[in-house]
């Protein structure tokens, strides 16, 4: 038994036929010693007398509000809730399995940007006697603060004969660092109480993995003279992180009729305009995704082909990013070839994802994960890799990136990747290895030495352990190269001489 909040206790029960249940001792919160009686809920039946009451809790009939009285006056209450465990698994009766992205997904979370603000939601078919309370933190062993509001009913839907209720909650990391590479996941814990049943649900994620931008705004069409083509332009959504030269998006532009089965014209671009063929009765849609990290695509923003007006959304500055005057070269060190570094780091992002594309289908955060991936270098908040830090002195950040590149280059050349099960030299991992080396050499020309970090001795003995470790390393590398790519893109746009 444990205390959920003041005067509310959760009794954990193994739930099987003829289970013995749990012995619970309740103590009346009073200085009084004599003449105390106990009742349950609205019943006037006296269950016992004395300052303590010992009960055997086996089923929901044994749970409820226990009240101690003296001479008709209520002294204190203790609400007992039951948390059922069947076959070693805690019950999940209150919330609906959303089955996306995988089975046993009860909580789903999304973030519109890297500010540390995110929304989680869940579904239930229960309409009454239902309460939720949400807690969150960054990391679990030494948790950093995340503040969550109250869960609210956000939608009601009819599903066949049933009504389905969606609840949501907004949370904000207290000291968010949008430009840093996350090393500890956000933990979200939801306590759910239905009548006398208690359940808890958890989710663990990095903000980068739950990013889903808002749709592009200000979609506009300009027909091209003597052509079937139209120029489509749009802007970054207002809610996306800034500056856009650092937090860049990529876009998918599609011209298609009302039915998904109709023929279409489709093109991908990093710019905020594109040229497509616009058929009568078709519409043009644009959606956005983080340019350097394969999180979710936004919903589509659409405009009909017939009119060449603009879609919903206010006007605002264009989202091509970059903007502003060119900034001075790096103080205290030579400036890197920003554009070359940008191209190579973007290639690294692509390679990192083709080397390990099945990211969403494998949950790598199980036992022992923190030890294996805490050893890899992360681009942290104080490393100067944010836009302001780069402007002040990019050398700190470049040195950190260089250390990471050398570290991962050595890891990819180590027994973890060269041992069984074997990889061929020109697999994406082989290309990744070569590109890491190439970028590190671009950053540190001959005769210029930065200190490098010691490689940890991660030598798994079993092939399956090696395979798991590879996935974890590649997963971590994807996050590292995404930050590096943002740094070089921003540098190329604002710091190139």
């Amino acid at each position: 038994i444990w205390e959920l909040k003041k005067d509310v206790y959760v009794v954990e029960l193994d739930w099987y036929p003829d289970a013995p249940g749990e012995m619970v001792v309740l103590t009346c919160d009073t200085p009084e010693e004599d003449g105390i009686t106990w009742t349950l809920d609205q019943s006037s039946e006296v269950l016992g007398s004395g300052k303590t009451l010992t009960i055997q809790v086996k089923e929901f009939g044994d749970a409820g509000q226990y009240t101690c009285h003296k001479g008709g006056e209520v002294l204190s209450h203790s609400l007992l809730l039951l948390h059922k465990k069947e076959d070693g698994i805690w019950s999940t009766d209150i919330l609906k399995d959303q089955k996306e992205p995988k089975n046993k997904t009860f909580l789903r979370c999304e973030a519109k940007n890297y500010s540390g603000r995110f929304t989680c939601w869940w579904l239930t078919t229960i309409s009454t006697d239902l309460t939720f309370s949400v807690k969150s933190s960054r990391g679990s062993s030494d948790p950093q603060g995340v503040t969550c509001g109250a869960a609210t009913l956000s939608a009601e839907r009819v599903r066949g004969d049933n009504k389905e209720y969606e609840y949501s909650v907004e949370c904000q990391e207290d000291s968010a660092c949008p430009a840093a590479e996350e090393s500890l996941p956000i933990e979200v814990m939801v306590d759910a109480v239905h009548k006398l049943k208690y359940e808890n649900y958890t989710s663990s994620f990095f903000i980068r993995d739950i990013i889903k931008p808002d749709p592009p705004k200000n979609l506009q069409l300009k027909p091209l003279k003597n052509s079937r083509q139209v120029e489509v332009s749009w802007e970054y959504p207002d809610t996306w992180s800034t500056p856009h030269s650092y937090f860049s998006l990529t876009f998918c532009v599609q011209a298609q009729g009302k039915s998904k089965r109709e023929k279409k014209d489709r093109v991908f671009t990093d710019k905020t305009s594109a040229t497509v063929i616009c058929r009568k009765n078709a519409s043009i849609s644009v959606r956005a995704q983080d340019r350097y990290y394969s999180s979710s695509w936004s919903e589509w923003a659409s405009v009909p082909c017939s009119g060449s007006g603009s879609s919903r959304g206010g006007s605002g500055s264009g989202g091509s990013g970059g903007g502003g005057s060119k900034l001075r070269a790096v103080p205290g060190g030579s400036s890197p070839a920003w554009t070359q570094c940008q191209q190579l780091s973007q290639k690294l992002c692509t390679l990192a994802w083709s080397a390990h594309p099945l990211v969403g289908h494998m949950d790598l955060r199980e036992e022992g994960d923190e030890e294996t991936t805490n050893d890899v270098p992360h681009i942290q908040c104080g490393d100067g890799c944010d836009p302001q830090g780069l402007r002040d002195n990019s050398q700190f950040c470049l040195q950190r990136i260089h250390q990471g590149l050398i570290f991962y280059e050595k890891l990819l050349g180590s027994d973890i990747f060269t041992g069984e099960p074997s990889l061929l030299p020109d697999s994406p991992v082989g290309q990744l290895h070569a590109s890491l080396l190439g970028l590190s050499q671009l950053l540190q020309p001959e005769g210029h030495h930065w200190e490098t970090q010691q490689i940890p001795s991660l030598s798994p003995s079993q092939p399956w352990q090696r395979l798991l470790l590879r996935f974890k390393i590649l997963r971590s590398l994807q996050a590292f190269v995404a930050v590096a790519a943002r740094v070089f893109a921003h540098g190329a746009a604002t710091l190139s001489p």
């Epitope: 079937r228 093109v267 040229t275 009568k280």
Partner: antibody, heavy 118, light 107 residues
Amino acid sequence: QVQLVQSGAEVKKPGASVKVSCKASGYTFTDYYLHWVRQAPGQGLEWMGWIDPENGDTEYAPKFQGRVTMTTDTSTSTAYMELRSLRSDDTAVYYCNANKELRYFDVWGQGTMVTVSS
Amino acid sequence: EIVMTQSPATLSVSPGERATLSCRASQSISINLHWYQQKPGQAPRLLIYFASQSISGIPARFSGSGSGTEFTLTISSLQSEDFAVYYCQQSNSFPLTFGGGTKVEIK
């Protein structure tokens, strides 16, 4: 399944015109874009243009503009490509292809060899 | 127009080995890049679309990667039926253009 069957080989004199046909089956003709791509002997692939059978819209590669005409007959589910003022370097295999997506080529015809020789 | 350059022009590989074919665009084309296989006397066949998307019915040994200006087609373990000419094609802008092709031959 989606199939494209092209007309037979042609031999033409320089300055003449050729009209190659491409009969589609296995799908609703107006549901796919149709492209023409050619390949000179021992050479690579060269895109010529596309037509939308639904409305007759066309887009031609600048190299062929003014010399090529693409048409369709929806009643027979057939596409045509006519190339005028033939030169010897127009000797090639001409392919039609169809796709629901405009910018790449999914289903190909078997090709029609056009030889331009005096 | 966008010029597509493929390398090498010829690649000699033994059956069972891995083949890596490169395609470079004269300007950034995002992921608007597609790969085709052509065997002698046959029409080309689409292998990969939008740089890395696989086509149903195409063996899993064919994979694509890249974005921007550099792209790669990888055949993980060459089978006898894979010896052919491979073309890349950009769809970033009209006119649509192809690379000159890479001939994969038996070593």
